[in-house]
């Protein structure tokens, strides 16, 4: 019987060009976490295997850093990074637990107001 629950950072926003930490936490279960997959829509971004360590998708290795903990750090954010992210905890013997995070990447305030401060 699956008794665990996943807590996430929920809906978050960040500025374009900045970075953000995606975090999930599995609680209320004694199941062993074997692997955590991080996905964006249907695309696998990264995995952290308890024995075999972190692996980042080649498509994202320049902008994704492992951690802290089982979380994921996204860097050099673009507006295209807006969307749903999922942490999928593979646990023994329970099975999989999935958490959802929605990230909105906003135009930075510098980009929005930069034209006002142009040097003549």
């Amino acid at each position: 019987m699956m008794t665990g629950t996943i807590e996430t950072t929920g809906n978050i926003s960040a500025e374009k060009g900045g970075s953000i930490i995606l975090q999930c936490h599995l609680s209320s279960t004694t199941a062993q976490v074997t692997q955590v997959n991080w996905e964006q829509q249907d695309q696998l971004l990264a995995i952290c295997n308890a024995d075999l360590g972190w692996h980042i998708s080649p498509s994202f290795k320049d902008r994704v850093a492992p951690g802290p903990g089982l979380g994921l750090t996204l860097q050099s954010l673009t507006v295209n990074d807006t969307g749903e992210y999922f942490c999928i905890y593979h646990t023994y013997p329970d099975g999989t637990y999935t958490g959802r995070i929605f990230l909105e990447v906003l135009e930075s305030s510098v980009a929005e107001h930069g034209a006002r401060f142009q040097i003549p």
Epitope: N49, H55, Y92
Partner: nanobody, 118 residues
Framework: EVQLVESGGGLVQPGGSLRLSCAAS????????MGWFRQAPGKEREFVSS????????VYADSVKGRFTISADNSKNTAYLQMNSLKPEDTAVYYC???????????WGQGTLVTVSS
């Protein structure tokens, strides 16, 4: 159920080379992380190397970096560990490991013995 069978171990002189193979059963091989651990006599099992994304992502223990190379052939469901410049301290039983979605835990092979001695 995922099953792993290692081969390629044996006796080699210091400075020599060996290539270990790990044949995996199961349909999800190409999407899984795979790797190698080793256990020397009287010591704890230690991580050696792992691979994912068809070889685009590899990780090595500091003790083998520059000497060992991990690779995978998805068409053969096989992972390899090329071991060069072997040292006596590389003597150990080498185990192949991969994640098994069948039962939500890592599957381990039975191991293959590597002995480095003159």
């Amino acid at each position: 159920e995922v099953q792993l069978v290692e081969s390629g171990g044996g006796l080699v002189q210091p400075g020599g080379s060996l290539r270990l193979s790990c044949a995996a059963s199961g349909p999800t091989f190409s999407t899984n992380v795979m790797g190698w651990f080793r256990q020397a006599p009287g010591k704890e099992r230690e991580f050696v190397s792992s691979i994912h994304w068809g070889g685009s992502s590899t990780v090595y223990a500091d003790s083998v970096k520059g000497r060992f190379t991990i690779s995978a052939d998805n068409s053969k469901n096989t992972a390899y560990l090329q071991m060069n410049s072997l040292k006596p301290e590389d003597t150990a039983v080498y185990y192949c490991v991969t994640y098994s979605a069948y039962d939500f835990r890592n599957a381990w092979g039975q191991g293959t013995l590597v002995t480095v001695s003159s």
